[in-house]
């Protein structure tokens, strides 16, 4: 499912708590996406060693994931809440094309793979409801991003496994980082 | 042995500075999420401030300008820089391990401590 | 900023007793919140994290409870080594705070 038990606006299973702020819909949205995350870490470690590689170790790849900088606004020092959620969104938004990847990546957790990457679809849009200063979104070009997929996709295996290692991690860390900044807003 | 060991502590004068460090062994420090935590003599714990994964930082508000957090994952080694000591600082200082797994801050794994003296 | 309340600060129980510690948030940290141990001399040791999960090694004498803003730890026969201090600590939110920490509560012997 793209949102948490009890999120959706037909769920009439408890009439008697009080509906969800928006904040707090994102906060458990991304609360939900990460234990989704979570989980088909566990099945990509279980395989390979590569989640006690350190981080320099693993630093040597051609991915351009997105990643939270100072400039962006979202951490505690220089802090601004308009500039960090169009960097959030706009993380989100070139993070599609990686968890298209990971599409056909899990045997086990295939099911949770689809529902991280449709939850992340309706994380996108309810940050879009949030942000003031939508034109400051860039999406990415769906040209480069087919041919970046299919760039991914004829890795060998083992560059195949790194990949994915990489690309939960670095999504992992960009959410947990979004999480903290709009607990500050 | 998976552990964190502190050292760096000591006598220092009134609005002086000290560099504490925090060595990890058994694991990567760069993989997890690190906070530094504090004690006075006879009080209560006191949170300081963390260092995440991605080398951002967050400091309690009374530490914010004077105290900065960094790593050095070549060496892995965490530190905590210290300016403009005041005699309420005297506290023996942990630092401590997040496994950074959730969102949520927890930690799982602390040193043994260090004591830092700030006295004229 | 959120802030943690603890209470009692300290009670005195005998070895069997059913002990239970509260603690409180000036805000809703939904179920974000450890418990840990500390001796004299001794570093802190987890216990118990999000809201009620026991972190390993812990014996099941101990359990956590609660969700929001209150939040119960409790251990239900009190041994000789539990005399100890034992602090609740937020992990909702660690920007524009004084204090992770609640105050602490000393277990003593009756």
């Known amino acids: 499912a793209p949102v948490p038990p009890g999120e959706d606006s037909k769920d009439v299973a408890a009439p008697h708590r009080q509906p969800l702020t928006s904040s707090e819909r994102i906060d458990k949205q991304i609360r939900y996406i990460l234990d989704g995350i979570s989980a088909l870490r566990k099945e990509t470690c279980n395989k390979s060693n590569m989640c006690e590689s350190s981080k320099e170790a693993l630093a040597e790849n051609n991915l351009n994931l997105p990643k939270m900088a100072e400039k962006d606004g979202c951490f505690q020092s220089g802090f601004n809440e308009e500039t960090c959620l169009v960097k959030i969104i706009t993380g989100l938004l070139e993070f599609e094309v990686y968890l298209e990847y990971l599409q056909n990546r899990f045997e086990s957790s295939e099911e949770q793979a689809r529902a991280v990457q449709m939850s992340t679809k309706v994380l996108i849009q309810f940050l879009q409801k949030k942000a003031k200063n939508l034109d400051a979104i860039t999406t990415p070009d769906p040209t480069t991003n087919a041919s970046l997929l299919t760039k991914l996709q004829a890795q060998n295996q083992w560059l195949q496994d790194m990949t994915t290692h990489l690309i939960l991690r670095s999504f992992k860390e960009f959410l947990q980082s979004s999480l903290r900044a709009l607990r500050q807003m | 042995e998976v552990q964190l060991v502190e050292s760096g502590g000591g006598l220092v004068q009134p609005g002086g500075s000290l560099r504490l460090s925090c060595a990890a062994s058994g694991f990567s420090l760069s993989n997890y999420y690190v906070t530094w935590v504090r004690q006075a003599p006879g009080k209560g714990l006191e949170w300081v401030g963390i260092i995440y994964g991605s080398d951002e930082t967050a400091y309690a508000t009374w530490a914010i300008g004077r105290f900065t957090i960094s790593r050095d994952n070549s060496k892995n080694t965490l530190y905590l820089q210290m300016n403009s000591l005041r005699a309420e600082d005297t506290a023996v200082y942990y630092c401590a391990r997040d496994d950074s797994s959730d969102w949520d801050a927890k930690f799982n794994l602390w040193g043994q401590g260090t004591l830092v003296t700030v006295s004229s | 900023a959120i802030q943690m309340t603890q209470s009692p600060s300290s009670l005195s129980a005998s070895v069997g007793d059913r002990v239970t510690i509260t603690c409180q948030a000036s805000q809703s940290i939904n179920n974000e919140l450890s418990w840990y141990q500390q001796k004299p001399g001794k570093a802190p040791k987890l216990l118990i994290y999000?809201?009620?999960t026991l972190a390993s090694g812990v014996p099941s004498r101990f359990s956590g409870s609660g969700s929001g803003t209150d939040f119960t730890l409790t251990i239900s026969s009190l041994q000789p080594e539990d005399f100890a201090t034992y602090y609740c600590?937020?992990?909702?939110?660690?920007?524009?705070?004084?204090?992770?920490f609640g105050g602490g509560t000393k277990v003593e012997i009756k």
């Open positions: 600590q937020q992990g909702y939110s660690l920007r524009n705070i004084d204090n992770a």
């Open positions: 999000r809201a009620s």
